[in-house]
């Protein structure tokens, strides 16, 4: 995957396709949820940073058994350069806090659609 | 359902303000740009700019830059478009759309808003 | 700003005929080209998004094709319910804008 770099500030150029279709699925996810997400599950929040996908997977890796966050922690391992596996982590979490993947879902959602608005919404 | 409602027609002396207010239901407001389009007699579809209701962001078409204001009240889920200084070309019928981001397209529209500016 | 180019302006055609509808982006605009329909009083209807994606309830007689700067909407057998004005959007970069129309009459 390429065309990700100066993500933080898009200017007028709408995202690649694989970030387009990141987004949608992160729509798909929480338009669609009708029981808890996922059983429910916890997962380490996370700073919304540069390095947010790679550490959006690391905590999304951990759920396991769960079909609806598949697609998504497939699309995210295609914007993280390096291999990542359950029990990882990085210095982008925050290692107190534990939410459930519904709202980090709409968190990481909320924070990319925020991202392509910069530079269009003053 | 989604549903955009709008205000209804209004007519107006050249120099007047209109205020155009767009109700929406069915979906999470603040989840979704509001846009507002306009279409004069006989004419095609121009885009007039863009409010995030979250953050009360605003983007707007050049051509209406200064005469146009576009706000947000989330308590009742209303979007409003405000144009001041009135024309005769300003005559058309005013449409808000929604958008989930700018680049999407617009899926769900108001009935439009005929403005009409005569002396 | 990127301009749209409709053409032709009026397609006379008749029912049961194939409709084809052209968009030309004064600038690559990828895929990000949405179509819409307008019937007289009524507001545009969303047909086609990202230049090819069909949407749910719209007839598959309509589809779109394209990238780039050349779009085409087709509508492969008109139904006396498809002789509207059809418009195309830049969903690239604001300003938005919008093709100046193609009206599909009955001949």
């Known amino acids: 995957l390429t065309c990700l770099g100066g993500f933080a500030s898009p200017g007028p150029v709408p995202p690649s396709t694989a970030l387009r279709e990141l987004i949608e699925e992160l729509v798909n996810i929480t338009q669609n949820q009708k029981a808890p997400l996922c059983n429910g599950s916890m997962v380490w929040s996370i700073n919304l940073t540069a390095g947010m996908y790679c550490a959006a997977l690391e905590s999304l890796i951990n759920v396991s058994g769960c079909s609806a966050i598949e697609k998504t922690q497939r699309m995210l391992s295609g914007f993280c350069p390096h291999k990542v596996s359950a029990g990882q982590f990085s210095s982008l979490h925050v290692r107190d806090t534990k939410i459930e993947v519904a709202q980090f879902v709409k968190d990481l959602l909320l924070h990319l659609k925020k991202l392509f608005r910069e530079g269009q919404f003053n | 359902q989604v549903q955009l409602v709008q205000s209804g027609a209004e007519v107006k002396k050249p120099g007047a303000s209109v205020k155009v207010s767009c109700k929406a239901s069915g979906y999470t407001f603040i989840d979704y740009e509001i846009h507002w389009v306009r279409q004069a007699p006989g004419q095609g579809l121009e885009w007039m700019g863009a409010i995030d209701p979250e953050t009360g962001g605003t983007a707007y078409n050049q051509k209406f830059k200064g005469r146009v204001t576009m706000t947000t009240d989330t308590s009742t889920s209303t979007a409003y478009m405000e144009l001041r200084s009135l024309r005769s070309d300003d005559t058309a019928v005013y449409y808000c759309t929604r958008i989930l981001l700018y680049y999407y397209p617009m899926d769900y529209w108001g009935q439009g808003t005929l403005v009409t500016v005569s002396s | 700003e990127i301009v749209l180019t409709q053409s032709p302006a009026t397609l006379s055609l008749s029912p049961g005929e194939r409709a084809t509808l052209s968009c030309r982006a004064s600038?690559?605009?990828?895929?990000?080209l949405h179509w819409y329909q307008q019937k007289p009083g009524q507001a545009p209807r969303l047909l086609i998004y990202?230049?090819?994606q069909s949407i749910s309830g719209i007839p598959a007689r309509f589809s779109g094709s394209g990238s780039g700067t050349d779009f085409t909407l087709t509508i492969s057998s008109l139904e006396p319910e498809d002789f509207a004005v059809y418009y195309c959007?830049?969903?690239?970069?604001?300003?938005?804008?919008f093709g100046g129309g193609t009206k599909v009459e009955i001949k």
């Open positions: 600038q690559n605009i990828s895929d990000y």
């Open positions: 959007q830049n969903g690239h970069s604001f300003p938005l804008t």
């Open positions: 990202y230049a090819s």
